[in-house]
């Protein structure tokens, strides 16, 4: 037999909270358990589902879970079935709702001294207790001479008067919790003696020196009082106007007129209506003075043909907000087409060259009008006026390559030399028309040049080859004065270049021919053995057919090159003694001798009392000091050559003589003793 160990039992439950109906079964065979609600099988959902044999509720629902639940156990083999006791939920809940008018049937029927009943549509279980509020303040039964009665969910006002006007709301609570009205009811019961608005003044914007009118009307029984005040609470009447409102007039119907408005008249005006009873009704309106600021400047715009472009006109700040429109050539632009206005934007669709020109954005309001021009340039691809051409430029002279183009806007032209951008310097100049000037053409300027002319619309380029026409010139120019060593072999080179390889020959300046021991070999003058007679003036002549001839004059001197007869030696001297550095040189012309001590030339005129250079070239230093130590160089030079030789000078302390050393013992190094 099937036995219920645990049976479901009726229980309290809270709306939206968890619950469990327990059911446990014992049977000999295999049984399956299911649940019935009001006799119908219960289907599992996420909210309500079987858990073992029990029925679990994730969130109790007062509508879907009301009724009788029963646990059923069935043995599918024997067909035996057992049912539990019935169980149900006592579901506690509360749900907010609006405050509604129950009596009279509509708001329009509410009159002073009639009964008004409001209903609070908050429901719940168990039945809630209700509390009413007017303008947030709780109401209690019998309040205001028993005119208010709160019976359960209804609030009755009998009779209703102006003092009952306000915002009505309700709250309710029960064992589940509390809820307040989702929508409140505003009760408005007019008191004939209260001032009521018939016509409220509106904000106005006027231009300076124009007039402004504010309308204001109230009604009441008996008729109400009406008063106008300006910002500083100064009353405005036809009898007493404040100084800044001399031109104000208050009409019998309550309207206020201000004429020839000035900036000081701008501000807040208050119209106050006061009935026999009730609070004053204050209406406000502001008088604004119309104004319009200047417009920001436009940058000139450059567009390319075929593109779509927009130019936004930022309207100037103003009151009232200025209206904006675009004009071109004095004609207002349409709102559609190829060139049109869209909002504050000027739209140019598929730009044509003819669209170039000045467009004007206008802005206007009561205070006046402003305008700003924008210059629109339609860029064109450059076209050639003069392309660079292959050119022959003369060495040493200025050379020009032209790259003349035209376009809108004026094109940018850059030049390349051997694919390298050319910088402006002392040799290269690029004029704004695109012409390249090479100020002093050199041989290596002979190469490829390319110019590129561009605008935002596109670019064109062309290249040209420069051939440099070489000057007829000596390379290098011969030294004008040269020396040859007597009785030795000597050569004097002379070479030149030109457009054609020049012929080079030597001759004596006096026109006489070269002696037989002197040969002219392809421009090199060769002396097998120099004699005294070889000295003199010679001319190198370079010539070719197209460029004629050039001459270089050379004066040759025959000399005996310098040799040293006496050279200074490494010398050590006791401190305080005298040092002698000997130096003698020979040559023709007779050489002059100079000394260099410690990296500076010793000027004979500025040597001081301790140093002296003898006629024969020797250097004497008296009373030597340690700082005189160092390398001394003897330099011998004449108009043909220069030679030098050097030796160190050491200055040492004189040793104290020892007993063992006799007076004749020599020092361990070469010493000058004085």
């Amino acid at each position: 037999a099937i036995v219920f160990i645990k049976q479901p039992s009726s229980q309290d439950a809270l709306q939206g909270r968890r619950a469990l109906l327990r059911c446990e079964v014992e049977a000999p065979g295999l049984v399956h358990v299911y649940w019935l609600l009001d006799g119908a099988p219960v289907q599992d959902t996420e909210r309500r589902f079987t858990q073992g044999s029990s029925l679990s509720f994730a969130a109790v629902d007062r509508l879907q879970d009301s009724g009788t639940f029963q646990c059923v156990a069935r043995d599918d083999v024997t067909g035996e079935e057992a049912r539990s006791a019935n169980a149900s939920f006592n579901i506690k809940w509360i749900e907010a709702g609006p405050v509604v008018l129950k009596h009279p049937a509509s708001e329009a029927e509410i009159q002073p001294q009639t009964q008004v009943t409001l209903r609070c549509h908050i429901d719940g279980h168990p039945r809630p207790t209700y509390q009413w509020f007017r303008d947030g303040t709780p109401l209690s039964d019998g309040q205001s001479n028993n005119t208010v009665s709160s019976k359960e969910r209804n609030l009755t006002l009998r009779p209703a008067g102006p003092e009952h006007s306000g915002l009505y709301s309700c709250c309710a609570h029960n064992a589940f919790g509390q809820a307040c009205s989702s929508q409140n009811f505003t009760l408005s019961i007019a008191d004939e003696s209260f001032a009521r608005v018939v016509l409220a003044p509106q904000d106005v914007i006027v231009a300076r020196n124009e007039e402004a009118m504010f309308h204001c009307q109230f009604s009441a029984q008996p008729p109400p009082n009406l008063q106008w005040l300006f910002e500083d609470e100064t009353p405005i009447t036809n009898r007493s106007r404040p100084p800044h409102l001399r031109r104000a007039t208050v009409f019998a119907n309550g309207s206020l007129l201000l004429t020839q408005v000035r900036p000081r008249n701008a501000g807040v005006y208050r119209c106050i209506g006061q009935g026999q009873r009730g609070p004053p009704v204050i209406l406000e309106a502001t008088l604004h003075l119309a104004e319009i600021e200047d417009m920001p400047l436009f940058e000139p715009r450059v567009f390319t043909a075929g593109s779509e472009e927009r130019v936004t006109c930022l309207p100037p700040k103003g009151l009232p907000e200025p209206s904006v429109w675009w004009e071109h050539a004095g004609v207002r632009l349409p709102t559609h087409g190829r060139v049109y206005q869209k909002g504050h934007e000027l739209v140019l669709a598929s730009i044509a060259e003819s669209d170039a020109g000045v467009y004007t954005c206008h802005a206007a309001n009561l205070a006046g009008q402003r305008r700003q021009d924008v210059n629109i340039t339609v860029a064109t691809v450059p076209t050639w006026l003069k392309k660079p051409q292959d050119s022959q430029l003369e060495e040493g002279k200025p050379g020009y390559l032209h790259c003349l183009t035209q376009a809108t806007p004026k094109p940018t032209v850059v030049w390349y030399r051997n694919q390298m951008l050319i910088s402006e310097d002392s040799r290269f100049e690029v004029f704004k028309n695109g012409t390249l000037r090479i100020n002093n053409v050199e041989v290596y300027d002979g190469t490829w040049y390319r110019c590129v002319s561009s605008t935002p619309a596109g670019s064109i380029e062309a290249q040209a080859r420069v051939q440099v026409l070489e000057k007829l010139k000596f390379t290098p120019p011969p030294q004008p004065q040269q020396c040859m060593e007597f009785d030795k072999e000597a050569t004097v080179p002379c070479s030149a270049t030109g457009r054609e390889k020049p012929t080079i020959k030597w001759e004596r300046a006096d026109g006489s021919s070269l002696p037989e021991w002197v040969t002219d070999n392809a421009g090199t003058l060769h002396f097998a053995r120099v004699t005294r007679d070889d000295a003199g003036n010679y001319t190198c002549i370079a010539s070719n057919g197209p460029q004629g001839q050039i001459r270089a004059h050379v004066q040759l001197t025959v000399a005996v090159f310098i040799t040293f007869k006496v050279e200074p030696e490494r010398t050590t001297v006791y401190q305080g003694h005298t040092a002698l550095l000997q130096c003698e040189a020979q040559g023709d012309p007779k050489p002059l001798i100079q000394w260099k001590g410690k990296d500076r030339i010793l000027d004979p005129t500025k040597l001081g009392p301790r140093m002296h250079i003898f006629q024969n070239g020797s250097l004497v230093i008296h009373d030597v000091a340690p700082e005189d130590s160092g390398r001394y160089t003897c330099i011998a030079g004449n108009s043909c050559n220069i030679k030098h030789t050097e030796a160190p000078l050491y200055v040492v302390d004189k040793p104290v003589p020892e007993e063992s050393e006799g007076p004749g013992s020599p020092p361990p190094y070469k010493m000058i003793q004085t």
């Epitope: 450059v302 940018t412 850059v414 402006e424 004029f431 704004k432 028309n433 002319s453 935002p456």
Partner: antibody, heavy 118, light 111 residues
Framework: QVQLQQSGAELVKPGASVKLSCTAS????????IHWVKLRTEQGLEWIGR????????KYAPKFQGKATITADTSSNTAYLQLSSLTSEDTAVYYC???????????WGQGTLVTVSA | DIVLTQSPASLAVSLGQRATISCRAS??????????MNWFQQKPGQPPKLLIY???NQGSGVPARFSGSGSGTDFRLNIHPMEEDDTAMYFC?????????FGGGTKLEIK
């Protein structure tokens, strides 16, 4: 060699105007664009505008439109910068510079100091 | 207008070391294969001197230790090795479109 010689320093009162000059030597200003640049220590360099002395065409930075007027006299090979309604913000060193159709400044004037002070 | 943002605002570099100054443009300054970005050096009391034109080309008489690189919107000026004489303000400048504009400048000093 190419030189741009600018006029001397100016001390001017607020609200007044001043006209600076830039005379070119060793080149013809008609062959180049002449630009003007403003230097203030804190703000750095600012491009004012340029003129094509050949046809008088000018271009200005929006900031200097209405403030600066650039002109040129080709007969004296001189470009001018006029500054109007001067305020302390206009106290600066003003340079003229030469550019060709390759848009870079290879040559500059030595600068003119303008001081605006009451 | 094309806005140029230079960084850093100031820089101290040891003698012999490398100094790098950056310049970023608010839009590309390239046109038909050329980057219209130039670099200037300015010393107190002197006009600016053109160091680099068209992003990477050395101005006339500018020592080889100054070099420029970059294209589009990002550019750099390199100085290596740094010398005493390089203490100055450095400005980038675009000449792709009017109005020509300058960067805010970088003050370069010896560390």
């Amino acid at each position: 060699q190419v030189q741009l010689q600018q006029s001397g320093a100016e001390l001017v009162k607020p609200g007044a105007s001043v006209k600076l000059s830039c005379t070119a030597s060793d080149f013809n200003i008609k062959d180049f664009y002449i630009h003007w640049v403003k230097l203030r220590t804190e703000q750095g360099l600012e491009w004012i505008g340029r003129i094509d002395p050949e046809d008088g065409e000018t271009k200005y930075a929006p900031k200097f439109q209405g403030k600066a007027t650039i002109t040129a006299d080709t007969s004296s090979n001189t470009a001018y910068l006029q500054l109007s309604s001067l305020t302390s913000e206009d106290t600066a060193v003003y340079y003229c510079a030469r550019a060709s159709s390759g848009p870079w400044f290879a040559y500059w004037g030595q600068g003119t100091l303008v001081t605006v002070s009451a | 207008d094309i806005v140029l943002t230079q960084s850093p605002a100031s820089l101290a570099v040891s003698l012999g070391q490398r100094a790098t100054i950056s310049c970023r443009a608010s839009e590309s300054v390239d046109n038909y294969g050329i980057s219209f970005m130039n670099w200037f050096q300015q010393k107190p009391g002197q006009p600016p001197k053109l160091l680099i034109y068209a992003a990477s080309n050395q101005g006339s008489g500018v020592p080889a230790r100054f070099s420029g690189s970059g294209s589009g919107t990002d550019f750099r000026l390199n100085i290596h090795p740094m010398e005493e004489d390089d203490t100055a303000m450095y400005f980038c400048q675009q000449s792709k479109e009017i109005p020509w504009t300058f960067g805010g400048g970088t003050k370069l000093e010896i560390k």
